[in-house]
Interface confidence: medium
Amino acid sequence: MANCEFSPVSGDKPCCRLSRRAQLCLGVSILVLILVVVLAVVVPRWRQQWSGPGTTKRFPETVLARCVKYTEIHPEMRHVDCQSVWDAFKGAFISKHPCNITEEDYQPLMKLGTQTVPCNKILLWSRIKDLAHQFTQVQRDMFTLEDTLLGYLADDLTWCGEFNTSKINYQSCPDWRKDCSNNPVSVFWKTVSRRFAEAACDVVHVMLNGSRSKIFDKNSTFGSVEVHNLQPEKVQTLEAWVIHGGREDSRDLCQDPTIKELESIISKRNIQFSCKNIYRPDKFLQCVKNPEDSSCTSEI
């Protein structure tokens, strides 16, 4: 401790007086302590503090478990080595700056997850994932991206790493809007969505949410990636299914300005466009399950 000299002044109370040298020492010590605290606590947090939620809890275990489950259920993917899949997945983002991820980073994973789906049985969707998945669970010969291995592995998960460390960041990950678009999750979905759209042929279906203000949104994955990667030499028609939200909604949402915009984009790519209203999605699903039900020939 710094030396403390007691000297009587007027009155009986002692006073602790520090020498200038001691004051300087104490000041420097406090500054160093503050700096150490800042470096130890604030800087790492500041470095990792992104606007989006962090990596999903138990991310490695979840990916591995999903891979094992998928390959058991789908005989055509039984050859896949799930440990290699996880290693390739991990390699795409670990030790890399989470705002500087590229499609190339995911190529080893894409190669391992290569899968053939019937190219004329593809169902795309935008902002209505649950219904699309319910549909393909019933109509087993049709596939969304999340019915493929890679889509299934990543569905509803978040992940990112940190530059120059092998750690997974469970605190926060970059948000597409607030932080950066080239983050691990966004680049993954852009990569697999592009490949999925490129594989499509004949008639491609897309489910769109008729309850949204923009039924077709140019900034969605469908609008920004999949639409532009359908191959006109293979795809004859894109058929949109506009899903109505309200029971009493009998409007023809195929006339919506955003649907007309989609039609224009598709037509310019030399692909035909058609559109259907699904007025009663609950009945639609029920009738796909049980088409012999006589009510299934009334309007849905």
Epitope: C254, F284, P291, D293, S294, T297, E299
Partner: nanobody, 122 residues
């Protein structure tokens, strides 16, 4: 693509019968729901009857008990037996097929035939 060709239309007296046929050709490997629609002069096209791939049937109220729809999957054909015809049944009758929407929404179906004329005289 699926092509639909109707036949069996014609002129008939009120109270008489006709049997319409619709033959599907092209890509008929999938399970289409098929239906009949009609359009009278100056009126909108309306649903008459529909049948799912495995036999579920539905009818417009105006034809219930008089018309019967059936199909022969082996021949990729659907039929409409029309009995007790009335002058108000006069219209062009169209065959339609759809992969998923299961009729009857007149603007949204996948495939349409060219139509066959049915005229019922009094």
């Amino acid at each position: 693509q699926v092509q639909l060709q109707e036949s069996g239309g014609g002129l008939v007296q009120a109270g008489g019968s006709l049997r319409l046929s619709c033959a599907a050709s092209g890509r008929t490997d999938t399970r289409y729901t098929m239906g009949w629609f009609r359009q009278a002069p100056g009126k909108e096209r309306e649903f008459v009857s529909g049948i799912t791939w495995n036999g579920g049937t539905s009818y417009a109220d105006s034809v219930k008990g008089r018309f019967t729809i059936s199909r022969d999957n082996g021949k990729n054909s659907v039929y409409l037996q029309m009995n007790s015809l009335k002058p108000e049944d006069t219209a062009v009758y169209y065959c339609a097929a759809d992969r998923f929407t299961l009729v009857p929404t007149t603007s949204d179906l996948d495939y349409w035939g060219q139509g066959t004329q049915v005229t019922v005289s009094s």
